[in-house]
Amino acid sequence: ATKLTEEKYELKEGQTLDVKCDYTLEKFASSQKAWQIIRDGEMPKTLACTERPSKNSHPVQVGRIILEDYHDHGLLRVRMVNLQVEDSGLYQCVIYQPPKEPHMLFDRIRLVVTKGFSGTPGSNENSTQNVYKIPPTTTKALCPLYTSPRTVTQAPPKSTADVSTPDSEINLTNVTDIIRVPVFN
């Protein structure tokens, strides 16, 4: 059975969160997708969304968030660049399917951003444009305002992944193996 999981990413200020959400290709390929933050006791807030209909592998940038929807692979890639401490929180991907409620995708991401030096001297890689070569246009797509009341409750943590070293080694609690998350400053 599919389990709702919440994964924890611990990153330093200035680093990049680079995650993916998968969806059923046949059902949702061209549906509009969104990246939301869930704050305790509040409705999920949409931070960025793809165009409607969603375009294949066409990056959409909203501030420091870049969404890329790979229709042909059933994957939504989400990058949050130049992370700030205040970006810490619980995030999720959803698919808009009006008039029905948004469809939540796996996994939820618990992001913890801490202060700390994460770049190389003289590096300008925290600049979104320098790193990603994406035209500085924000999405023309309007993100729907409605959100699902049932996604307000928090999922119980399943495991945690701590990124604490420069070479991006992660230790998972309650898991026998180690995973790595690439961290590019």
């Epitope: 796996f106 026998t176 995973i179 590019f184």
Partner: antibody
Framework: QVQLVQSGAEVKKPGASVKVSCKAS????????INWVRQATGQGLEWMGW????????GSVQKFRGRVTMTRNTSIHIAYMELSSLRSEDTAVYYC???????????????WGRGTLVTVSS | DIQMTQSPSSLSASVGDRVNITCQAS??????LNWYQQKPGKAPNLLIY???NLETGVPSRFSGSGSGTAFTFTISSLQPEDIATYYC?????????FGQGTRLEIK
């Protein structure tokens, strides 16, 4: 022991289908993507696609779309790759490989099966 | 799709030599690049991930460098057991593609 064990060699006729299995052990099967990579004799590596064993969702490269199906049985920790409408050019060794953590944009393959040779011949 | 071009396609070197293999990406892939070793009749084995990080258990004579479009894989002192074909692989976007491979032989 962390490993991926694949099913044995297959000989198929053109137009037939083949289903290759990949049994995972020693790690949490649903936490990591399973990828399929093939290699024709004397040739390079060709990525076919991926599957998230937790959600069951999968994706494949354009070349294989409509011919490849990736499934899994989470209770026995097995991933399957079925390729249909086989032709002689599909003769290759098919590898399953553990990819990144399901939520992360990590596509390095740190654990591989030994490969399954599929021969397509009339 | 991003094309990965490896050079040379084959090379012959002596035990103890320093060996370099390059991989050129057709567009900027930042550090989204991995290196694999494949011995005859065996499955590939991950050596380097994210351009420069050594996989656990891999000997320190193997290293990787580069970012953007140009990458180098180095064996600091070639050993007889390093006879294999080496592949680079990017994951900057989808689809994932591999270089065509570099066959390494001992002189």
């Amino acid at each position: 022991q962390v490993q991926l064990v694949q099913s044995g060699a297959e000989v198929k006729k053109p137009g037939a289908s083949v289903k290759v299995s990949c049994k995972a052990s020693g790690y949490t099967f649903t936490r990591y993507d399973i990828n399929w990579v093939r290699q024709a004799t004397g040739q390079g590596l060709e990525w076919m696609g991926w599957m998230n064993p937790n959600s069951g969702n999968s994706g494949s490269v354009q070349k294989f779309r409509g011919r490849v199906t990736m499934t899994r049985n989470t209770s026995i920790h097995i991933a399957y790759m079925e390729l249909s409408s086989l032709r002689s050019e599909d003769t290759a060794v098919y590898y399953c490989a553990r990819g990144g953590y399901t939520s992360s944009w990590r596509w390095y393959f740190d654990l591989w099966g030994r490969g399954t040779l599929v021969t397509v011949s009339s | 799709d991003i094309q990965m071009t490896q050079s040379p396609s084959s090379l012959s070197a002596s035990v103890g030599d320093r060996v370099n293999i390059t991989c050129q990406a057709s567009q900027d892939i930042r550090k989204h690049l991995n290196w694999y070793q494949q011995k005859p009749g065996k499955a590939p084995n991950l050596l380097i991930y994210d351009a420069a990080n050594l996989e656990t258990g891999v000997p320190s004579r193997f290293s990787g460098s580069g970012s953007g479009t140009a990458f180098t894989f180095t064996i600091s002192s070639l050993q007889p057991e390093d006879i294999a074909t080496y592949y680079c692989q990017h994951y900057a976007n989808l689809p994932i593609t591999f270089g065509q491979g570099t066959r390494l032989e001992i002189k």
